[in-house]
């Protein structure tokens, strides 16, 4: 049940990431650590790297408020789960600084990709033999 809540939150975060992608030109063009092809059992560690990244509004135009609200939602800590706690203690996961740094557009694309991977794993884990290739 706790894991379900977590994944439901991930699904909602995908929408927020998609919204932010529409305002990518209004974000500070700073390079941010963006995990990609995250190894199994390091997903939660990579997720926390995305949440810690200093994504910022460029404070230009009329979109500043909606951008800041969306960034705040992205950074909201999900409820703790055993899976998350187990992974947190994995010393073998790369540190945030070790991931390649990318501008906001690619950062958001990679964040979305990780969220999709986590949801898909969750859905597949409930279904015996669901993965076909």
């Amino acid at each position: 049940q706790g894991q379900d809540r977590h994944m439901i939150r991930m699904r909602q975060l995908i929408d927020i990431v998609d919204q932010l992608k529409n305002y990518v030109n209004d974000l500070v063009p700073e390079f941010l650590p963006a995990p990609e092809d995250v190894e199994t059992n390091c997903e939660w560690s990579a997720f926390s790297c995305f949440q810690k990244a200093q994504l910022k509004s460029a404070n230009t135009g009329n979109n500043e408020r909606i951008i800041n609200v969306s960034i705040k939602k992205l950074k909201r800590k999900p409820p703790s789960t055993n899976a998350g706690r187990r992974q947190k203690h994995r010393l073998t996961c790369p540190s945030c600084d070790s991931y390649e740094k990318k501008p906001p557009k690619e950062f958001l694309e990679r964040f979305k990709s990780l969220l999709q991977k986590m949801i898909h794993q969750h859905l597949s884990s409930r279904t015996h033999g669901s993965e076909d290739s």
Epitope: E109, H120, T127, S130
Partner: antibody, heavy 117, light 107 residues
């Protein structure tokens, strides 16, 4: 705004292979999940399967032995092949995007495929 | 497979009416439920995901609730453009499955 458009023959003979293509515009196919759903005349919707842009697939077990979904990122297209068709495969076939993995946020208008000799 | 049962199969209503459609899953699906609106010859439209989250661009008169096995889609004040068929869809496990649909008709 992402738009999807199905294309392919509207008539297929029994025992042959149904082939449809979905062309995606207004967005890149190189992220997200891309699926096929069908609706036989007078019936409800049935999920056929989907493919992740990086190649992994999930299929409905009821169709699994006959279905192949593939993606062509260079053309921003994905396709459906359904082999050994019968009259029961007559349906409106929809292609759709699933950004959230669990639901479909953009759909094509659908294309009617009739299986008949 | 998880069976999704919608009721009623059709409902007659007038503009301004409050309309409620229910969807029942054959087993618990947490909040993994989506609702779609479908008009003949048009592309289906996602209204609600994870049971109660409103899809971007969908009017606030649409709302979803429920968890476990019982779910509800409510249209608070029916508009002329809302006459359509509505489907629920579960995503708790593969295969993804849809309800049989509820047709909302003009009274």
């Amino acid at each position: 705004q992402v738009q999807l458009q199905e294309s392919g023959p509207g008539l297929v003979k029994p025992s042959e292979t149904l082939s449809l293509t979905c062309t995606v515009s207004g967005g890149s196919i190189s992220s997200d999940f891309w699926g096929w759903i069908r609706q036989p005349p007078g019936k409800g919707l049935e999920w056929i399967g989907y493919i992740y842009s990086r190649g992994s697939t999930n299929y409905n077990p009821s169709l699994k032995r006959r279905v192949t979904i593939s993606v062509d990122t260079s053309r921003n297209q994905f396709s459906l092949k359904l082999s050994s068709v019968t009259a029961a495969d007559t349906a409106v076939y929809y292609c759709a995007r699933s950004a959230g993995v669990t639901d479909f946020d953009f759909w094509g208008q659908g294309t009617l495929v009739t299986v008949s000799s | 497979d998880i069976q999704m049962t919608q009721s009623p199969s059709s409902v007659s209503a007038s503009v301004g009416d409050r309309v409620t459609i229910t969807c029942r899953a054959s087993q618990g699906i947490s909040s993994w439920l989506a609702w779609y609106q479908h008009k003949p010859g048009k592309a289906p439209k996602l209204l609600i995901y994870v049971a109660s989250s409103l899809q971007s661009g969908v009017p606030s008169r649409f709302s979803g609730s429920g968890s476990g096995t019982d779910f509800t889609l409510t249209i608070s004040s029916l508009q002329p453009e809302d006459f359509a068929t509505y489907y629920c869809q579960q995503a708790n496990s593969f295969p993804l499955t849809f309800g049989g649909g509820t047709k909302v008709e003009i009274k």
